[in-house]
Amino acid sequence: MKVLQEPACVSDYMSISTCEWKMGGPTNCSAELRLLYQLVFQSSETHTCVPENNGGVGCVCHLLMDDVVSMDNYTLDLWAGQQLLWKGSFKPSEHVKPRAPGNLTVHTNVSDTVLLTWSNPYPPDNYLYNDLTYAVNIWSENDPAYSRIHNVTYLKPTLRIPASTLKSGISYRARVRAWAQHYNTTWSEWSPSTKWYNSYREPFEQR
């Protein structure tokens, strides 16, 4: 049994780090492999993660952690029974992928404006809470040529779009993702998308 692609891990900077790797051949990850992890810290214990399959040769493991701080460093050991397949280390603060924003809602009852709101995925006491900026993707299923990215660089998880900039009488979808500038993170996954119908019509005298 051999590791083809070494484990690569990202942290949500809250409670979970996700490690993915590829094996040299088809593997029943949960039955054959264990990923052991241990914080390099006084009296810390070794913890075990049972991986899941992620495609035929891919494995993924969700490491449960306490809150993350910048000093944290983990040793990682990938075992197949009594055989050590790979040994490495992982510093969560240097490999952060934020959680996806949630509760994306579209408010169309505001005059002349489409208001999108969503929730910050972190609690206020988390370091990422005040560091997230967002990208909102809006597209139309009726108009394949229409797709826009709106960068939200302020802290408030809202975006206002003049309804007049969207075509009337067709449906739109929106989704949002996040990243944290000062932690040099990757982008989060996209939130689930939400759909709305743009019924806005310009006043008669502006037509």
Epitope: L39, S43, S44, E45, L64, D67, V69, M71
Partner: antibody, heavy 125, light 112 residues
């Protein structure tokens, strides 16, 4: 009530051996690291050894490394310190203390918040 | 090893007056914000040590609020706002960031 009770101290000749015990009660013993601290007559406190809750991680002061062995029996809620090749400078009151909660991924530290009453070890010919 | 240096080593205090003990470490004891791995212990005559303050500034259960800890990094202070007769004994700071845990030399607090 959370309590630690040491036993096993006594008078021993240089080169001899003693085994100290520390019985814990009133808390989930296996979840916590444990520590031994000693105090020579008229002197300050000196850390001796620590062990994680599972017993997998063990630490010693240089002054006792290779001579003392810390261990625990979680089924008996008891911590041990096996002391071999004793020297005159090992003469001290030995205290066991409850250390950090070590079952969490990052051990939770609340200080050495419970101490035993101490057991006296005298090494003399 | 981390060296812990306490001062003063002797502290005569009038009851009702404040007292302050300093502890300096040879390297930083801050692991993360709010987590300085330094404790303060009081050992009264003929007794086991008892925990007063842990993680730099957190008061242990049952410890009177006249005891407080402060500081960060390498410089730490234990303050007693109003000393009482029962506070006499030896005060020790200790670092537990890494083994070997190390103690200060101890400060003897006595009543004038």
């Amino acid at each position: 009530e959370v309590q630690l009770v040491e036993s096993g101290g006594g008078l021993e000749q240089p080169g001899g051996s003693l085994r100290l015990s520390c019985a814990g009660s009133g808390f989930t013993f296996r979840d916590f690291a444990m520590t031994w601290v000693r105090q020579a007559p008229g002197k300050g406190l000196e850390w001796v050894s620590s062990i994680s809750g599972s017993g997998d991680n063990i630490y010693y002061a240089d002054s006792v490394k290779g001579r003392f062995t810390i261990s625990r029996d979680n089924s008996k809620n008891t911590l041990y310190l096996q002391m071999n090749s004793l020297r005159a400078e090992d003469t001290a009151v030995y205290y066991c203390a409850k250390d950090r909660l070590s079952v969490t991924v990052r051990p939770r530290y609340y200080g050495l918040d419970v101490w035993g009453q101490g057991t006296t070890v005298t090494v003399s010919s | 090893d981390i060296v812990m240096t306490q001062s003063p080593l002797s502290l005569p205090v009038t009851p009702g007056e404040p007292a302050s003990i300093s502890c300096r470490s040879s390297q930083g004891l801050l692991y993360s914000i709010g987590y300085n791995y330094v404790d303060w212990y009081l050992q009264k005559s003929g007794q086991s040590p008892q925990l007063l303050i842990y993680l730099g500034n957190k008061r242990a259960s049952g410890v009177p609020d006249r005891f407080s800890g402060s500081g960060s990094g390498t410089d730490f202070t234990l303050k007693i706002s109003r000393v009482e007769a029962e506070d006499v004994g030896f005060y020790y700071c200790m670092q537990s960031l890494q083994t070997p845990y190390t103690f200060g030399q101890g400060t003897k607090l006595e009543i004038k």
